[in-house]
Each structure stands twice: as structure tokens, then as C-alpha cells.
Interface confidence: medium
């Protein structure tokens, strides 16, 4: 179920997945929620005396049991991911942090009259992930009322330092407040030849687009279908970027599909989850568990309720079926995507809906997934 | 162009920007170089502004923001709007511009081939539309020339999408069923070009459409192959008039 409480002066021991910098525990919790494997986190609001670089550290953690031993640590805040908290799921982070310099790669500096204006500039710049604004009281006159637009490979600050008269915050693209516009085009038989930031395995271009949308540095993508000539690249989704923010002219390529991230969309922004169940398809990955259920929908529901499950394969092969149902294999991987996709007539595969926003139906007890 | 991408310099060397210089100077329409002294464009570009002296024509340009008052431009010597064009009806949306002085051809500024009359039934598969127009219905003109590849739509199918309007045989339609890629405001008069048998041909002149890039609403273009006789006749009669008035 949903565990939203925070534990003050508590640090979870072990289970480390990744460490990043975040300005507060709420932002750390968000980062954990949208990380494919993170279930628990610990945030250091105060630094240990000899380790000043650990202040603002956000330590993302996982656990097979869903819990980790707690140790007392002054100034630490710990908690759970909100992966199973439906209505509380939002990547949007509107808070402004006074007296903090969130550092990253500064790619633009301009004069603005207010923090709001600076945040808007960041929100409306394709590359901007976070910003720092120097107020009119900042100690260096030449930087006063300056708005620094920033980015990093992780989408989060590379370090955070307390500095008087600096104010920092995040782009509001994830709040659907960007005015950049939203190119919905899907280009059949076209490939973009731009810089790859990552690659994942996906069953179709639409899942590829959603993965791109929620990747911090993906601006557009090219997906190679199952008919693609190079076997190792079949069902591979290449996440791409470019300096200009726009793709170079696409190359005509049979069995390639290209498109744009929807992270600047206001209305058409997708949820970070994939509803479709793919029949005749098997998703490979690390086996978490196998149960016997009746139907692929029930398998998806089981995966969704199993917090660590990221995707599943339901097999209708005679040897995989019993009286109580057929085999539902619950799986996971490091990036949340299958490690390989194969085509098997008797299989159906899909994804956990743990990151979908759910709405309570007023007249029935079951949760309806809002699509 | 909605759903397009940036072009590179010299990629579409026949594309020109038609601009109006009144109080300020603004890009109004596109056009295509078809000869040293000739630009082919849409008649509707001149609705309400049929005064040759306010128009400036820029060729060999990729980025409109780089145009300054020092940038060379061509002026209109003669504006020939199709005699049957009526502003309110959309047919015969074609115009020829004769330039004051002939253009120098370079790798960034050269003509596009016209189709032949026999090409009225040719099936084109690799077609592109270009322009500096809006990238969405409620947008603004772009600095960098945009391009998009777009499939042609048979006239019968196009007519079904536009029940309120008549799609004549002098029109050609192009667009995706699902929308998303199309010409838009400011692309008017510009080229719809198709590569056929290894060479680019001017198949259409951007004319009109219901909004831009809407689902089931293809762009409508003036079909150039239907006007080959008109184009040649106008160019020829202009040459003859020039000979009559020359001081020789």
C-alpha cells in the first residue's frame, strides 16, 4: 500500500541504488518515486561535520523485503517512494529554495526582474532543468538580478551549496506549464541521426515516446521495430538530444519510427506508465516472482500490486497452465524496461501500472485507472 | 510549416521570401524561382496589397533574422495575377512576378524545374513543402526555413474532407490523415516540390487549408502542371512586350 510518512532523524542502512543532490526531502522522495527501482530514500538535511559534501544528499535505496534497518542520524529524513500512492503521484515540483545555489552546467544567463520570471524562462527553455536567481542584494553586483539556466546529465543538481541572496528552483515543464509547444508528430520510416543519451528496449514507439518524455535529457527518439534489419537493435528505443534542441533532418529508414518527447506538453503529457497489454510478446528481465492467475489483466493487476514489479509476461503455454490459471511472471530490470523482447504466440506482456494516477470510483470499490 | 525541421543553406535554392515594406518590413509569403527574372507564387498573397513597389524579394536566404537593410533584394517589375483569380473563391491561385533585374544563379539561389503538362497524372512519392510560416495555427513566422515531407492525397479523397469547398482539378492536396504536418500561415505561395526521376519539380504552390495540420484536413495547393500553358504564355508575352518597347 501507500506509505507517505517521513521519518525524522532516521537513515536507512544499505540497499543503495544511487545518490543525487536534492534541495529537500520532498524532492528526494519524488526522485525516488520516479526511479525504476527505488523503494526507500534517506535525505541529509544537515551535513556530518567532516563531510560537508554529503549535505543535501539524497540516497535512493531498494530492498527485497520493502524495508531496511533504520539508524538514528541527526538531520536525516527518510521515507518511502510514493509508487503506490496513485493520487499523490506528480513529478511537478514548484517549490523555490531561498539561500541555495543548485549547481549544474550553466548554459544561459540573462537579467530578469523576478524569481517568477526566471522560473518561467527556465520552464520555456527546452534544455533548462533547474535555475538559480541572484537577487538585487547578491554580493557580486554584476550578477544581481541574473537568472542562470542550468542542466545536468541526471536532471538534478551536481551539488547544492547554501549562498545568501541566491534563490533556486526547478523547471515547471513537469507541471505542464511550459509554453514551448508540444510536437505530437510520429514519423514513420524516419530516423534521427542525433546524439544518443540512452537506449532502452520497448515494444512500440509510443512506449518509447513515454520513456523519452520522462528521461531528463531526452528531446526526441528513434525506435526500431521488430522488422529492423539489425537484430540487436530490434525493439530498441534510442533516446536522443541535440545542442539546438531540435533534431537534424530525419533520414528515410524503413522500419524506424521517430518522434519527440512530450515533456513540454500542456495537455497531451502522458502518464509515466503504459496501459497496453501486448499479445504474442514476451518481456525478458530479472525474475521477481511467478504466480498463476486467470488472464493477462489479472497478471497486470498482480504486477501493479507487487511494488518491485516493473513488467510481466503471462504465458498460455500448456506446460505453464494449472487449474487456478496460467503462469504470470513478474519481472524487473535496472532501467524499468525489458532487457529483451521476443515474439511468442502464447505470451502476453505489459507493464506495472504503479506509476499511473488512479481515481477512486464513487460507486464501486475498485480503483479505475484514468487513461 | 507545422511538424517540420530546420533546412540547411542551399537545400531549397529556389525558395524566396516575399516581404512587404510599409512602416515595418514583414515576411508575407513564399515563392519559387523558375527563371532568372521570374518568381512563381500564389495570387492571394497580393490581396489588398497589389502595389509592386512595397514588395521586396529575398533569395538565397536561410535565416530571415539575418536580413538587414544592407541585404540585397529584388523588386517587382511586373505582377501578373491570374485573370480568373477571385479573392473569395480560391481557384486560379497563381501569380507570376517579373523581377526588375535578373538574378545571378549560385548554389544557394537557382531555379526549380517546372513539371510538363504530361505530368498532370504523375504519381509522386517523395514530396516536400517548405516555408518560414507558422509552426502552429496560432503561431508566428519562423526565422529558419522549415521543411517537411508530406504525401499527396487524391483529389476525390480531398474533396470528401472539404465538403464546403470545391476541390478543382487545378488543385492538388497533400497531408497526413492524422494531421500533424502541414504548411501554415506565411507559407503561402511557397513550393510543394517532389523528386521524380532524380530531379526536383515544382508540383504545387501553397494555397489554403482549414486551419493547419488538422486531422483529416489536407493542405490544398495550386497544381502547377495545370498552369504550364498559362506560365509560358505570360513569360512569352512579357518578352515580346519588352522587345516592342526596347530602344533598338
Amino acid at each position: 500500500g501507500c506509505l507517505s510518512q517521513l521519518y525524522a532523524n532516521t537513515f536507512f542502512r544499505g540497499g543503495d541504488l544511487a545518490a543525487i543532490y536534492t534541495p529537500d526531502a520532498q524532492h528526494c522522495q519524488k526522485m525516488c518515486t520516479f526511479h525504476p527501482r527505488c523503494l526507500l530514500f534517506s535525505f541529509l538535511a544537515v551535513s556530518p561535520t567532516k563531510e560537508t559534501d554529503k549535505r543535501f544528499g539524497c540516497f535512493m535505496k531498494e530492498s527485497i523485503t520493502g524495508t531496511l534497518p533504520r539508524i538514528h542520524r541527526t538531520g536525516a529524513i527518510s521515507g518511502h517512494s510514493l509508487k503506490q500512492c496513485g493520487h499523490q503521484l506528480s513529478a511537478c515540483h514548484q517549490d523555490i529554495y531561498e539561500g541555495l545555489d543548485m549547481r549544474g552546467s550553466n548554459f544561459n544567463i540573462s537579467k530578469t526582474d523576478s524569481i517568477e520570471e526566471c522560473q518561467k524562462l527556465c520552464t520555456n527553455n527546452i534544455h533548462c532543468q533547474f535555475f538559480t536567481y541572484a537577487t538585487k542584494a547578491f554580493h557580486r553586483p554584476e550578477y544581481r538580478k541574473s537568472c542562470l539556466l542550468k542542466r545536468s546529465s541526471s536532471g538534478t543538481p551536481t551539488s547544492i551549496k547554501p549562498v545568501d541572496n541566491l534563490v533556486s528552483g526547478f523547471s515547471l515543464k513537469s507541471c505542464a506549464l511550459s509554453e514551448i509547444g508540444c510536437p505530437m508528430d510520429i514519423f514513420q520510416h524516419f530516423a534521427f541521426a542525433d546524439l544518443n543519451v540512452s537506449q532502452v528496449v520497448t515494444p512500440d514507439a509510443f512506449v518509447c515516446r513515454t520513456v523519452c518524455t520522462f528521461h531528463p535529457n531526452c528531446l526526441f527518439f528513434t525506435f526500431y521495430t521488430n522488422e529492423w534489419e539489425t537484430e540487436s537493435q530490434r525493439n530498441v528505443c534510442f533516446l536522443k538530444t541535440s545542442k539546438s534542441g531540435r533534431p537534424s533532418p530525419p533520414i528515410i529508414q524503413e522500419n524506424a519510427v521517430s518522434g519527440y518527447s512530450l515533456f513540454t506538453c500542456r495537455k497531451a503529457r502522458p502518464e509515466p506508465c503504459h496501459f497496453k497489454i501486448y499479445s504474442g510478446v514476451a518481456f525478458e528481465g530479472e525474475e521477481l516472482n511467478a504466480t498463476f492467475v486467470q488472464g493477462a489483466d489479472a497478471c497486470q493487476e498482480t504486477c501493479t500490486k507487487t511494488i518491485r514489479c516493473q513488467f510481466f509476461t503471462y504465458s498460455l503455454l500448456p506446460q505453464d497452465c494449472k487449474a487456478e490459471g496460467c503462469k504470470c511472471s513478474l519481472r524487473l530490470s535496472t532501467d524499468g524496461s525489458p532487457t529483451r523482447i521476443t515474439y511468442e504466440a502464447q505470451g502476453s506482456s505489459g507493464y506495472s501500472l504503479r506509476l499511473c494516477k488512479v481515481v477512486e470510483s464513487s460507486d464501486c470499490t475498485t480503483k479505475i485507472n484514468a487513461r | 510549416i507545422v511538424g517540420g525541421t530546420n533546412s540547411s543553406l542551399g537545400e531549397w535554392p529556389w525558395q524566396v521570401s516575399l516581404q512587404v515594406k510599409l512602416v515595418s518590413q514583414n515576411h508575407m509569403c513564399g515563392g519559387s524561382i523558375i527563371g532568372r527574372q521570374w518568381i512563381l507564387t500564389a495570387a492571394h498573397c497580393f490581396d489588398g496589397i497589389p502595389y509592386p513597389d512595397v514588395w521586396r524579394i529575398y533569395g538565397g536566404i536561410l535565416n530571415l533574422s539575418e536580413i538587414t537593410n544592407k541585404t540585397p533584394f529584388s523588386s517587382i517589375k511586373e505582377l501578373i495575377i491570374h485573370q480568373k483569380y477571385k479573392m473569395s473563391e480560391g481557384s486560379y491561385d497563381i501569380a507570376l512576378i517579373k523581377l526588375q533585374t535578373p538574378l545571378n544563379y549560385t548554389e544557394f539561389q537557382k531555379p526549380i524545374c517546372l513539371p510538363s503538362k504530361a505530368d498532370t497524372n504523375t504519381i509522386y512519392t517523395n514530396c516536400w513543402v517548405t516555408g518560414w510560416g507558422y509552426t502552429k495555427e496560432r503561431g508566428e513566422t519562423q526565422n529558419i526555413l522549415q521543411k517537411a515531407t508530406i504525401p499527396l492525397v487524391p483529389n476525390e479523397e480531398c474533396q470528401k474532407k472539404y465538403r464546403d469547398y470545391v476541390i478543382t482539378k487545378q488543385m492538388i492536396c497533400a497531408g497526413y490523415k492524422e494531421g500533424g504536418i502541414d504548411a501554415c500561415k506565411g507559407d503561402s505561395g511557397g513550393p510543394l516540390v517532389c523528386k521524380h526521376s532524380g530531379r526536383w519539380q515544382l508540383v504545387g504552390i501553397t494555397s489554403w487549408g482549414e486551419g493547419c495540420a488538422r486531422k483529416e484536413q489536407p493542405g490544398v495547393y495550386t497544381k502547377v502542371a495545370e498552369y504550364i500553358d498559362w506560365i509560358l504564355e505570360k513569360i512569352q508575352s512579357s518578352k515580346e512586350r519588352a522587345l516592342e518597347t526596347s530602344p533598338a
Partner: antibody
Framework: EVQLLESGGGLVQPGGSLRLSCAAS????????MIWVRQAPGKGLEWVSY????????TYADSVKGRFTISRDNSKNTLYLQMNSLRAEDTAVYYC???????????????????WGQGTLVTVSS | DIQMTQSPSSLSAFVGDRVTITCRAS??????LNWYHQKPGKAPKLLIY???RLQSGVPSRLSGSGFGTDFTLTISSLQPEDFGNYYC?????????FGGGTKVEIR
């Protein structure tokens, strides 16, 4: 020569109904959008309703929505405005106008009114 | 709805004077702006469409300009037949709305 001639106006009691007609000539009526615009005595112009060439799409001002219906008969070159539940504030001269198809800058919009009729007066009073 | 504000509401000028009427939209409307002239007891007549394009048959002493929210109609040399009311109208979005009008009188 383009001509538009309105008829059907007159005195009507609040809550009553009236049907205005606009006879068109001198142009291909079925190719144009048509519009009704009204003008209360001593006041400015107010757009009332709009209909596409085929009659397939209509729009109304909020002040008349649900009470007025625009329609056309392309075979008779006539535009209509059926006005029900009339109120005192509907008192005005009603003009029909032709929408110019603005085939301009790659946009097709009926968004200016290039020819107008002389108008017909509708008075709603008890 | 988009509000259209015209100014001045009335003016009086001599024949031969240059007259300027302004129209402001409550939100940007691109160049979707038209100007009409109406004489007392008569139907309105289209003068300018798309902010700056002159309707055929309209004398060239009239001109229009503007983009976004601010527009002007200029009569370079006022003539006796130019008296009456002038209205701007936006066609950016339904409901199409008119300005309140400017009454032009000849002194």
C-alpha cells in the same frame, strides 16, 4: 452585383417568435459562409450567428444561444434566422452579411464580412 | 470573450486632416482585425481586412496597421464622404466582437 435583402422584421411581444430571411443574389451563395449581425438603436454592432456554406456548422453569440437558430436553403439562395423567446434586449436592426473566404497566408477563414444587406428592424415590446 | 476597445469614441476634424483611430484587443489576435465604416441609417461597409489589406474599391487614403493587440486605421486626408461611424472587429475567435465605434464628424 452582390445583393442581400433581409425581410421578416416587425413588432413582436416578449416571449414571441419571428423568422428573418435574407435573399442573396449576384454570387454563388452555396460557396460562402453567412452571418447575422445586429445593432440596437443608437448602439454598436453585435455579431449574432454564423453558418458554414453547406450549413454543416453553426455558431452563436452567448446572448442568443438556445433561442435563435441560423439555417440556410442553398437551393433558394436564402439565409434564415429563427428567433424564439424574444426579449426586449433583442430589439435591433438585424443585418445579414456574407463571410469573405480569407484564403490568405495558407489559412482559410470566413472571418470578415464583405457584403451586407440593408437590415430589417425587429422590435420586442409589450 | 475578446474585448475590443476603440479610441477616441468621437472626433471632429477638417477636410484634408489626417485622422487616426486606434483599436486595442484584450488579448493578442495576430492580424485578425477588420475595419468597417457605417453612415447613419445605412449598412456597414468593409474597408480593411487582415489589419492592413484594403478591400477592393476602397480609396487608398485609408490604411490600416498593427499586429497582436494594437491596431490603427488612418485616413491620410479626410474627405466629406468619410463622416460616420468606424468599427473594428476581431475574427481571431468566436464570438467575433466589434469595438464600440468611433464617430467621425466633419468640422
Amino acid at each position: 452585383e452582390v445583393q442581400l435583402l433581409e425581410s421578416g422584421g416587425g413588432l413582436v411581444q416578449p416571449g414571441g417568435s419571428l423568422r428573418l430571411s435574407c435573399a442573396a443574389s449576384g454570387f454563388t451563395f452555396s460557396a460562402y459562409s453567412m452571418i447575422w449581425v445586429r445593432q440596437a438603436p443608437g448602439k454598436g454592432l453585435e455579431w449574432v450567428s454564423y453558418i458554414r456554406p453547406s450549413g454543416g456548422r453553426t455558431t452563436y453569440a452567448d446572448s442568443v444561444k438556445g433561442r435563435f437558430t441560423i439555417s440556410r436553403d442553398n437551393s433558394k439562395n436564402t439565409l434564415y434566422l429563427q428567433m424564439n423567446s424574444l426579449r426586449a434586449e433583442d430589439t435591433a436592426v438585424y443585418y445579414c452579411a456574407r463571410g469573405g473566404l480569407l484564403l490568405w497566408f495558407r489559412e482559410l477563414k470566413s472571418n470578415y464580412f464583405d457584403y451586407w444587406g440593408q437590415g430589417t428592424l425587429v422590435t420586442v415590446s409589450s | 470573450d475578446i474585448q475590443m476597445t476603440q479610441s477616441p469614441s468621437s472626433l471632429s476634424a477638417f477636410v484634408g486632416d489626417r485622422v487616426t483611430i486606434t483599436c486595442r484587443a484584450s488579448q493578442p489576435i495576430d492580424n485578425y482585425l477588420n475595419w468597417y465604416h457605417q453612415k447613419p441609417g445605412k449598412a456597414p461597409k468593409l474597408l480593411i481586412y487582415a489589419a492592413s489589406r484594403l478591400q477592393s474599391g476602397v480609396p487608398s487614403r485609408l490604411s490600416g496597421s498593427g499586429f497582436g493587440t494594437d491596431f490603427t486605421l488612418t485616413i491620410s486626408s479626410l474627405q466629406p464622404e468619410d463622416f460616420g461611424n468606424y468599427y473594428c472587429q476581431q475574427s481571431y475567435t468566436v464570438p467575433y466582437t466589434f469595438g464600440g465605434g468611433t464617430k467621425v464628424e466633419i468640422r
